[in-house]
Interface confidence: low
Protein backbone atom coordinates (compact mmCIF):
# COMPACT_ATOMS: atom_id res chain seq x y z
CA UNK A 1 0.00 0.00 0.00
CA UNK A 2 1.73 3.05 -0.92
CA UNK A 3 0.06 6.79 0.44
CA UNK A 4 0.56 9.89 -1.21
CA UNK A 5 0.21 13.32 0.37
CA UNK A 6 -0.22 16.21 -1.30
CA UNK A 7 1.96 18.14 -2.18
CA UNK A 8 0.84 21.92 -1.36
CA UNK A 9 1.52 22.31 2.06
CA UNK A 10 -2.13 22.68 4.15
CA UNK A 11 -3.91 21.69 0.70
CA UNK A 12 -2.93 18.24 0.79
CA UNK A 13 -5.02 15.48 0.47
CA UNK A 14 -4.27 11.24 0.71
CA UNK A 15 -4.11 9.14 -2.29
CA UNK A 16 -3.53 5.22 -1.72
CA UNK A 17 -2.63 2.68 -4.62
CA UNK A 18 -2.02 -0.84 -4.46
CA UNK A 19 0.86 -2.94 -6.56
CA UNK A 20 -0.72 -5.20 -8.51
CA UNK A 21 -0.18 -7.40 -11.35
CA UNK A 22 -1.66 -7.46 -14.85
CA UNK A 23 -1.95 -10.95 -16.67
CA UNK A 24 -0.58 -10.16 -20.31
CA UNK A 25 -3.82 -10.49 -23.01
CA UNK A 26 -6.73 -9.90 -20.14
CA UNK A 27 -7.82 -6.68 -18.31
CA UNK A 28 -6.03 -5.46 -15.70
CA UNK A 29 -7.06 -2.92 -12.46
CA UNK A 30 -4.50 -0.04 -11.51
CA UNK A 31 -5.74 0.69 -8.30
CA UNK A 32 -6.25 4.32 -6.36
CA UNK A 33 -8.46 6.00 -4.44
CA UNK A 34 -9.09 9.71 -2.60
CA UNK A 35 -10.30 11.38 -0.15
CA UNK A 36 -13.61 12.05 -2.11
CA UNK A 37 -15.13 15.58 -2.95
CA UNK A 38 -19.11 16.08 -2.98
CA UNK A 39 -18.60 17.25 -6.22
CA UNK A 40 -17.48 15.55 -9.65
CA UNK A 41 -16.77 18.61 -11.54
CA UNK A 42 -13.92 19.77 -9.35
CA UNK A 43 -12.73 16.55 -9.23
CA UNK A 44 -9.63 15.84 -11.84
CA UNK A 45 -7.99 12.17 -12.11
CA UNK A 46 -4.22 11.98 -14.09
CA UNK A 47 -2.85 8.89 -14.30
CA UNK A 48 0.80 9.40 -15.62
CA UNK A 49 4.13 6.32 -16.42
CA UNK A 50 7.33 6.92 -15.82
CA UNK A 51 9.33 7.12 -18.98
CA UNK A 52 6.05 7.91 -20.93
CA UNK A 53 5.41 11.35 -22.55
CA UNK A 54 1.93 11.30 -22.52
CA UNK A 55 -0.74 11.05 -20.16
CA UNK A 56 -2.32 7.12 -19.67
CA UNK A 57 -5.36 8.30 -18.98
CA UNK A 58 -6.99 11.90 -17.49
CA UNK A 59 -10.45 12.51 -15.75
CA UNK A 60 -12.00 16.06 -15.45
CA UNK A 61 -15.24 17.93 -15.35
CA UNK A 62 -17.36 14.96 -15.15
CA UNK A 63 -16.01 12.71 -18.16
CA UNK A 64 -12.51 11.39 -20.18
CA UNK A 65 -10.22 14.44 -21.47
CA UNK A 66 -7.86 11.77 -23.73
CA UNK A 67 -6.50 14.66 -25.62
CA UNK A 68 -2.87 13.85 -24.08
CA UNK A 69 -3.27 10.41 -23.93
CA UNK A 70 0.30 8.56 -25.36
CA UNK A 71 -0.20 5.87 -28.21
CA UNK A 72 0.55 3.24 -26.56
CA UNK A 73 -2.79 3.84 -24.41
CA UNK A 74 -5.55 5.15 -26.96
CA UNK A 75 -8.49 3.04 -26.34
CA UNK A 76 -7.36 0.92 -23.79
CA UNK A 77 -7.84 2.68 -20.52
CA UNK A 78 -10.97 3.72 -18.42
CA UNK A 79 -11.91 4.55 -15.21
CA UNK A 80 -14.93 3.97 -13.04
CA UNK A 81 -16.82 6.85 -13.76
CA UNK A 82 -19.61 6.52 -11.45
CA UNK A 83 -17.37 5.90 -8.47
CA UNK A 84 -15.03 8.79 -9.04
CA UNK A 85 -17.45 10.67 -6.71
CA UNK A 86 -17.01 8.20 -3.83
CA UNK A 87 -12.97 8.35 -4.07
CA UNK A 88 -11.88 5.55 -6.43
CA UNK A 89 -9.75 6.73 -9.34
CA UNK A 90 -8.97 2.90 -10.27
CA UNK A 91 -7.79 2.31 -13.84
CA UNK A 92 -9.00 -0.45 -16.13
CA UNK A 93 -6.29 -1.22 -18.45
CA UNK A 94 -7.64 -3.05 -21.32
CA UNK A 95 -5.42 -6.21 -22.65
CA UNK A 96 -2.06 -5.95 -20.75
CA UNK A 97 0.87 -5.69 -22.40
CA UNK A 98 4.23 -7.04 -21.14
CA UNK A 99 4.89 -3.10 -22.25
CA UNK A 100 2.84 -1.90 -19.59
CA UNK A 101 5.09 -2.99 -16.58
CA UNK A 102 6.47 -0.36 -14.75
CA UNK A 103 5.83 3.00 -12.12
CA UNK A 104 2.69 4.50 -12.30
CA UNK A 105 1.43 7.44 -10.74
CA UNK A 106 -2.43 8.43 -9.88
CA UNK A 107 -2.26 12.21 -9.67
CA UNK A 108 -5.52 13.93 -7.91
CA UNK A 109 -6.59 17.34 -8.22
CA UNK A 110 -9.54 18.17 -5.79
CA UNK A 111 -11.39 21.64 -4.07
CA UNK A 112 -9.51 20.11 -0.80
CA UNK A 113 -5.91 19.96 -2.44
CA UNK A 114 -3.79 18.06 -4.70
CA UNK A 115 -2.12 14.55 -3.97
CA UNK A 116 -0.42 11.64 -5.39
CA UNK A 117 0.82 8.19 -5.30
CA UNK A 118 3.05 5.64 -7.31
CA UNK A 119 2.51 2.22 -8.28
CA UNK A 120 4.41 -0.58 -9.24
CA UNK A 121 2.67 -2.55 -11.90
CA UNK A 122 3.85 -5.86 -13.22
CA UNK A 123 3.12 -7.61 -16.09
CA UNK A 124 3.37 -11.47 -17.14
CA UNK A 125 1.24 -14.36 -17.14
CA UNK A 126 -0.33 -16.64 -14.39
CA UNK A 127 -3.02 -19.25 -14.57
CA UNK A 128 -4.66 -22.15 -12.79
CA UNK A 129 -3.07 -25.13 -12.65
CA UNK A 130 -4.94 -28.36 -13.96
CA UNK A 131 -4.05 -31.61 -11.92
CA UNK A 132 -5.33 -35.32 -13.41
CA UNK A 133 -4.35 -38.34 -12.78
CA UNK A 134 -2.50 -40.13 -15.95
CA UNK A 135 -3.59 -43.59 -16.62
CA UNK A 136 -1.78 -44.13 -19.57
CA UNK A 137 1.57 -44.89 -18.03
CA UNK A 138 3.44 -48.26 -16.80
CA UNK A 139 2.38 -46.50 -12.83
CA UNK A 140 0.09 -44.14 -11.52
CA UNK A 141 1.18 -40.74 -12.48
CA UNK A 142 -0.15 -37.39 -12.08
CA UNK A 143 0.27 -34.80 -14.77
CA UNK A 144 -0.18 -30.73 -13.89
CA UNK A 145 -1.22 -28.81 -16.85
CA UNK A 146 -1.55 -24.71 -16.52
CA UNK A 147 -1.83 -22.86 -20.42
CA UNK A 148 0.20 -19.50 -19.65
CA UNK A 149 2.79 -18.50 -17.80
CA UNK A 150 5.37 -15.58 -18.03
CA UNK A 151 8.21 -15.53 -16.93
CA UNK A 152 9.26 -18.95 -16.87
CA UNK A 153 7.95 -20.59 -13.23
CA UNK A 154 9.14 -22.99 -10.64
CA UNK A 155 7.18 -25.73 -10.40
CA UNK A 156 7.23 -27.76 -7.11
CA UNK A 157 5.17 -31.01 -6.02
CA UNK A 158 4.47 -31.44 -2.40
CA UNK A 159 2.37 -34.56 -0.72
CA UNK A 160 0.16 -34.22 2.32
CA UNK A 161 1.74 -37.55 3.83
CA UNK A 162 5.28 -37.16 2.70
CA UNK A 163 5.48 -33.50 4.31
CA UNK A 164 9.13 -31.85 2.85
CA UNK A 165 9.94 -35.04 0.33
CA UNK A 166 11.68 -33.98 -2.28
CA UNK A 167 10.03 -34.89 -5.63
CA UNK A 168 12.38 -33.23 -8.07
CA UNK A 169 13.98 -36.60 -8.40
CA UNK A 170 10.30 -38.37 -9.54
CA UNK A 171 8.73 -35.56 -11.38
CA UNK A 172 9.51 -34.12 -14.78
CA UNK A 173 8.26 -30.72 -15.68
CA UNK A 174 8.77 -29.24 -19.17
CA UNK A 175 7.69 -25.40 -20.89
CA UNK A 176 6.24 -25.17 -24.23
CA UNK A 177 5.81 -22.04 -25.89
CA UNK A 178 2.77 -20.53 -27.13
CA UNK A 179 1.85 -19.38 -30.46
CA UNK A 180 1.91 -15.93 -29.25
CA UNK A 181 6.03 -16.29 -28.53
CA UNK A 182 5.75 -14.86 -24.88
CA UNK A 183 3.71 -17.24 -22.68
CA UNK A 184 4.43 -20.57 -21.96
CA UNK A 185 2.37 -24.15 -21.46
CA UNK A 186 3.71 -25.93 -18.05
CA UNK A 187 3.33 -29.33 -17.65
CA UNK A 188 4.40 -31.42 -15.03
CA UNK A 189 4.38 -35.08 -14.27
CA UNK A 190 4.34 -36.43 -11.15
CA UNK A 191 5.29 -41.00 -10.90
CA UNK A 192 4.92 -43.81 -8.59
CA UNK A 193 1.89 -41.85 -6.93
CA UNK A 194 0.07 -43.54 -3.71
CA UNK A 195 -3.45 -43.80 -3.41
CA UNK A 196 -5.25 -41.73 -0.63
CA UNK A 197 -3.04 -39.71 -0.35
CA UNK A 198 -3.02 -35.38 -1.81
CA UNK A 199 0.05 -33.87 -3.87
CA UNK A 200 -0.18 -30.38 -4.47
CA UNK A 201 1.22 -29.11 -7.59
CA UNK A 202 2.96 -25.57 -7.26
CA UNK A 203 3.75 -23.09 -9.67
CA UNK A 204 5.19 -19.53 -9.22
CA UNK A 205 6.87 -17.01 -10.69
CA UNK A 206 7.32 -13.67 -9.32
CA UNK A 207 4.02 -12.06 -10.84
CA UNK A 208 1.83 -15.08 -8.74
CA UNK A 209 1.82 -18.37 -6.92
CA UNK A 210 -0.47 -21.00 -8.38
CA UNK A 211 -1.71 -24.37 -6.53
CA UNK A 212 -3.57 -27.18 -7.78
CA UNK A 213 -4.69 -29.98 -5.10
CA UNK A 214 -5.56 -33.73 -5.59
CA UNK A 215 -6.87 -36.30 -3.51
CA UNK A 216 -7.23 -39.94 -5.49
CA UNK A 217 -9.44 -42.53 -3.42
CA UNK A 218 -10.33 -45.70 -5.16
CA UNK A 219 -13.83 -44.55 -5.92
CA UNK A 220 -13.12 -40.55 -6.43
CA UNK A 221 -11.23 -37.63 -7.36
CA UNK A 222 -11.10 -34.41 -4.74
CA UNK A 223 -9.72 -31.25 -6.17
CA UNK A 224 -8.83 -27.57 -5.00
CA UNK A 225 -7.32 -25.00 -6.90
CA UNK A 226 -6.31 -21.44 -5.63
CA UNK A 227 -4.03 -18.27 -7.43
CA UNK A 228 -2.32 -15.57 -5.72
CA UNK A 229 -0.95 -12.74 -6.70
CA UNK A 230 2.45 -11.97 -5.03
CA UNK A 231 3.70 -8.32 -4.22
CA UNK A 232 0.40 -6.75 -3.71
CA UNK A 233 1.80 -3.77 -1.51
CA UNK A 234 -0.22 -0.72 -1.46
CA UNK A 235 1.01 2.64 -1.08
CA UNK B 1 -7.98 -43.36 -35.13
CA UNK B 2 -9.72 -44.07 -32.00
CA UNK B 3 -13.41 -45.01 -31.98
CA UNK B 4 -16.34 -46.09 -30.10
CA UNK B 5 -18.80 -47.86 -31.44
CA UNK B 6 -22.20 -48.25 -29.41
CA UNK B 7 -24.43 -50.94 -30.08
CA UNK B 8 -27.94 -50.12 -32.44
CA UNK B 9 -31.15 -48.56 -30.80
CA UNK B 10 -33.33 -50.38 -28.33
CA UNK B 11 -37.61 -50.29 -28.64
CA UNK B 12 -37.62 -52.31 -24.72
CA UNK B 13 -41.31 -52.52 -22.48
CA UNK B 14 -41.32 -50.90 -18.79
CA UNK B 15 -40.27 -53.35 -16.66
CA UNK B 16 -37.44 -54.95 -18.55
CA UNK B 17 -34.23 -54.92 -18.89
CA UNK B 18 -31.53 -53.83 -21.49
CA UNK B 19 -27.51 -54.08 -22.48
CA UNK B 20 -25.91 -51.15 -24.28
CA UNK B 21 -22.26 -52.25 -26.02
CA UNK B 22 -19.21 -50.08 -26.50
CA UNK B 23 -16.57 -51.46 -28.36
CA UNK B 24 -12.99 -49.49 -28.20
CA UNK B 25 -10.74 -49.25 -31.26
CA UNK B 26 -7.67 -47.71 -31.82
CA UNK B 27 -5.85 -47.22 -28.47
CA UNK B 28 -5.35 -49.42 -25.59
CA UNK B 29 -8.49 -50.32 -24.02
CA UNK B 30 -7.16 -51.00 -20.44
CA UNK B 31 -5.39 -47.29 -20.62
CA UNK B 32 -8.34 -45.18 -20.22
CA UNK B 33 -11.69 -45.10 -18.14
CA UNK B 34 -15.04 -45.27 -20.01
CA UNK B 35 -17.64 -43.16 -19.09
CA UNK B 36 -21.75 -43.34 -19.27
CA UNK B 37 -23.68 -40.91 -20.30
CA UNK B 38 -27.33 -40.14 -20.37
CA UNK B 39 -28.82 -37.46 -23.10
CA UNK B 40 -33.02 -37.52 -22.27
CA UNK B 41 -35.01 -35.78 -25.88
CA UNK B 42 -34.15 -32.51 -25.76
CA UNK B 43 -32.24 -32.05 -22.06
CA UNK B 44 -29.00 -31.80 -21.10
CA UNK B 45 -26.21 -34.85 -20.34
CA UNK B 46 -25.97 -36.55 -17.38
CA UNK B 47 -23.04 -38.22 -15.99
CA UNK B 48 -23.85 -41.83 -15.13
CA UNK B 49 -20.41 -43.31 -13.89
CA UNK B 50 -16.93 -44.59 -14.92
CA UNK B 51 -15.12 -48.10 -15.02
CA UNK B 52 -11.81 -48.85 -14.88
CA UNK B 53 -11.35 -51.43 -17.49
CA UNK B 54 -7.76 -52.95 -15.62
CA UNK B 55 -9.91 -54.46 -12.49
CA UNK B 56 -13.51 -53.33 -13.54
CA UNK B 57 -13.49 -50.59 -10.67
CA UNK B 58 -16.86 -48.19 -10.49
CA UNK B 59 -18.09 -44.97 -10.03
CA UNK B 60 -21.68 -43.90 -10.37
CA UNK B 61 -23.67 -41.23 -9.47
CA UNK B 62 -26.26 -41.72 -6.80
CA UNK B 63 -28.89 -40.69 -8.90
CA UNK B 64 -28.54 -44.13 -11.18
CA UNK B 65 -27.21 -46.60 -8.39
CA UNK B 66 -29.35 -49.19 -8.91
CA UNK B 67 -30.54 -48.49 -12.09
CA UNK B 68 -27.54 -48.87 -14.40
CA UNK B 69 -24.76 -51.35 -14.02
CA UNK B 70 -20.89 -50.75 -15.66
CA UNK B 71 -18.80 -53.60 -16.92
CA UNK B 72 -15.95 -54.62 -19.28
CA UNK B 73 -14.85 -57.58 -21.53
CA UNK B 74 -10.86 -56.59 -21.49
CA UNK B 75 -10.57 -59.47 -24.25
CA UNK B 76 -12.85 -57.73 -26.76
CA UNK B 77 -12.07 -54.28 -25.76
CA UNK B 78 -15.67 -53.72 -24.94
CA UNK B 79 -17.72 -51.73 -21.99
CA UNK B 80 -21.28 -52.82 -21.06
CA UNK B 81 -24.09 -50.65 -19.49
CA UNK B 82 -27.01 -52.78 -17.99
CA UNK B 83 -30.10 -50.65 -17.36
CA UNK B 84 -33.02 -52.48 -15.13
CA UNK B 85 -36.15 -51.88 -14.23
CA UNK B 86 -36.97 -49.87 -17.20
CA UNK B 87 -39.82 -47.02 -17.22
CA UNK B 88 -40.28 -44.39 -19.61
CA UNK B 89 -38.04 -41.82 -17.96
CA UNK B 90 -34.68 -43.99 -19.21
CA UNK B 91 -35.90 -43.54 -22.56
CA UNK B 92 -32.82 -41.34 -23.73
CA UNK B 93 -29.76 -41.33 -26.11
CA UNK B 94 -26.67 -42.90 -24.30
CA UNK B 95 -23.11 -42.48 -24.80
CA UNK B 96 -20.00 -44.10 -24.06
CA UNK B 97 -17.18 -41.70 -23.78
CA UNK B 98 -13.23 -41.30 -23.04
CA UNK B 99 -11.51 -38.49 -21.02
CA UNK B 100 -8.67 -37.49 -22.06
CA UNK B 101 -7.33 -38.30 -18.60
CA UNK B 102 -9.20 -39.72 -15.45
CA UNK B 103 -11.66 -37.27 -14.24
CA UNK B 104 -10.94 -34.84 -17.36
CA UNK B 105 -12.99 -33.73 -20.17
CA UNK B 106 -13.73 -36.50 -23.01
CA UNK B 107 -12.49 -36.19 -26.31
CA UNK B 108 -13.61 -39.08 -28.02
CA UNK B 109 -17.77 -40.14 -27.71
CA UNK B 110 -19.72 -42.92 -29.06
CA UNK B 111 -22.48 -42.39 -31.82
CA UNK B 112 -24.80 -42.59 -29.09
CA UNK B 113 -27.77 -45.47 -28.03
CA UNK B 114 -30.88 -44.69 -28.50
CA UNK B 115 -33.49 -46.38 -26.01
CA UNK B 116 -37.22 -46.28 -26.31
CA UNK B 117 -38.96 -47.52 -23.35
CA UNK B 118 -42.30 -48.31 -24.74
CA UNK C 1 -23.43 -31.43 -6.62
CA UNK C 2 -21.83 -28.16 -8.14
CA UNK C 3 -24.33 -26.81 -10.72
CA UNK C 4 -23.67 -25.53 -13.77
CA UNK C 5 -25.53 -22.41 -15.45
CA UNK C 6 -25.38 -21.34 -19.01
CA UNK C 7 -26.71 -18.48 -21.04
CA UNK C 8 -28.23 -17.72 -23.48
CA UNK C 9 -30.69 -20.50 -23.55
CA UNK C 10 -30.31 -19.62 -27.01
CA UNK C 11 -28.87 -17.65 -29.33
CA UNK C 12 -29.56 -16.55 -33.06
CA UNK C 13 -26.40 -14.88 -35.23
CA UNK C 14 -25.29 -13.98 -38.07
CA UNK C 15 -22.18 -15.21 -40.38
CA UNK C 16 -19.37 -13.18 -39.86
CA UNK C 17 -21.00 -12.07 -36.26
CA UNK C 18 -18.72 -12.73 -32.59
CA UNK C 19 -20.73 -14.76 -30.45
CA UNK C 20 -20.57 -15.12 -26.32
CA UNK C 21 -21.93 -17.94 -24.77
CA UNK C 22 -21.75 -18.15 -20.33
CA UNK C 23 -21.33 -20.73 -17.48
CA UNK C 24 -21.09 -20.02 -14.62
CA UNK C 25 -20.25 -23.06 -11.65
CA UNK C 26 -22.06 -22.55 -8.43
CA UNK C 27 -18.38 -22.86 -6.72
CA UNK C 28 -15.22 -22.39 -7.68
CA UNK C 29 -13.89 -24.95 -10.16
CA UNK C 30 -10.80 -23.17 -10.83
CA UNK C 31 -9.52 -24.40 -14.62
CA UNK C 32 -11.50 -27.38 -14.86
CA UNK C 33 -14.43 -26.46 -17.12
CA UNK C 34 -14.62 -27.68 -20.84
CA UNK C 35 -16.96 -26.75 -23.64
CA UNK C 36 -18.59 -29.15 -26.19
CA UNK C 37 -20.08 -28.42 -29.64
CA UNK C 38 -23.52 -31.10 -30.43
CA UNK C 39 -24.89 -31.02 -34.00
CA UNK C 40 -28.69 -32.26 -34.57
CA UNK C 41 -28.42 -35.92 -34.61
CA UNK C 42 -24.85 -36.47 -33.49
CA UNK C 43 -22.42 -37.00 -30.24
CA UNK C 44 -20.96 -33.98 -28.65
CA UNK C 45 -17.33 -33.08 -29.62
CA UNK C 46 -15.16 -31.30 -27.47
CA UNK C 47 -14.05 -28.25 -28.15
CA UNK C 48 -11.96 -26.38 -25.22
CA UNK C 49 -11.01 -28.21 -21.85
CA UNK C 50 -8.85 -26.43 -18.79
CA UNK C 51 -11.51 -23.14 -19.49
CA UNK C 52 -9.12 -22.17 -22.10
CA UNK C 53 -7.10 -24.93 -24.17
CA UNK C 54 -8.55 -25.51 -27.49
CA UNK C 55 -8.73 -29.51 -28.32
CA UNK C 56 -7.39 -31.01 -31.65
CA UNK C 57 -8.37 -30.24 -34.95
CA UNK C 58 -10.85 -27.06 -33.44
CA UNK C 59 -10.63 -24.19 -35.66
CA UNK C 60 -9.04 -20.90 -34.03
CA UNK C 61 -12.57 -18.88 -34.28
CA UNK C 62 -13.22 -20.77 -30.90
CA UNK C 63 -11.75 -19.40 -27.88
CA UNK C 64 -12.49 -20.34 -24.18
CA UNK C 65 -11.80 -17.70 -20.89
CA UNK C 66 -12.23 -17.35 -17.12
CA UNK C 67 -11.57 -19.49 -13.49
CA UNK C 68 -13.13 -20.07 -10.90
CA UNK C 69 -17.16 -19.39 -11.29
CA UNK C 70 -17.44 -17.24 -14.81
CA UNK C 71 -16.55 -18.80 -17.55
CA UNK C 72 -16.98 -17.77 -21.33
CA UNK C 73 -16.81 -19.75 -25.42
CA UNK C 74 -16.35 -17.60 -28.03
CA UNK C 75 -17.01 -17.90 -31.44
CA UNK C 76 -15.37 -15.21 -34.02
CA UNK C 77 -16.20 -14.85 -37.35
CA UNK C 78 -19.51 -17.28 -37.26
CA UNK C 79 -20.06 -19.97 -39.51
CA UNK C 80 -22.70 -21.68 -40.93
CA UNK C 81 -21.38 -25.34 -39.98
CA UNK C 82 -21.20 -23.43 -36.23
CA UNK C 83 -24.92 -23.94 -35.87
CA UNK C 84 -25.40 -26.55 -32.80
CA UNK C 85 -26.14 -26.74 -29.28
CA UNK C 86 -22.71 -25.74 -26.94
CA UNK C 87 -22.45 -27.20 -23.65
CA UNK C 88 -20.58 -26.58 -20.87
CA UNK C 89 -19.25 -29.26 -18.04
CA UNK C 90 -17.15 -28.77 -15.24
CA UNK C 91 -14.94 -31.90 -13.63
CA UNK C 92 -14.14 -30.29 -10.60
CA UNK C 93 -15.10 -33.73 -8.66
CA UNK C 94 -15.99 -37.21 -9.54
CA UNK C 95 -19.45 -36.18 -10.33
CA UNK C 96 -19.33 -34.14 -13.74
CA UNK C 97 -22.27 -32.17 -14.52
CA UNK C 98 -23.21 -30.31 -17.60
CA UNK C 99 -25.14 -26.54 -18.47
CA UNK C 100 -28.44 -26.71 -19.48
CA UNK C 101 -27.01 -25.98 -23.37
CA UNK C 102 -26.89 -22.99 -25.25
CA UNK C 103 -28.70 -23.05 -29.19
CA UNK C 104 -27.04 -21.22 -31.38
CA UNK C 105 -29.37 -20.75 -35.19
CA UNK C 106 -28.26 -18.44 -37.44
CA UNK C 107 -30.59 -15.45 -38.69
Known amino acids: LIIGFGISGRHSITVTTVASAGNIGEDGILSCTFEPDIKLSDIVIQWLKEGVLGLVHEFKEGKDELSEQDEMFRGRTAVFADQVIVGNASLRLKNVQLTDAGTYKCYIITSKGKGNANLEYKTGAFSMPEVNVDYNASSETLRCEAPRWFPQPTVVWASQVDQGANFSEVSNTSFELNSENVTMKVVSVLYNVTINNTYSCMIENDIAKATGDIKVTESEIKRRSHLQLLNSKAS | EVQLQQSGPELVKPGASVKISCKAS????????MNWMKQSHGKSLEWIGDINPNNGGTSYNQKFKGKATLTVDKSSSTAYMELRSLTSEDSAVYYCARPYYYGSSYDYWGQGTTLTVS | DIQMTQSPASLSASVGETVTITCRASENIGSYLAWYQQKQGKSPQLLVYAATLLADGVPSRFSGSGSGTQFSLKINSLQSEDVARYYCQHYYSTLVTFGAGTKLELK
Open chain 2, 26 to 33: GYTFTDYY
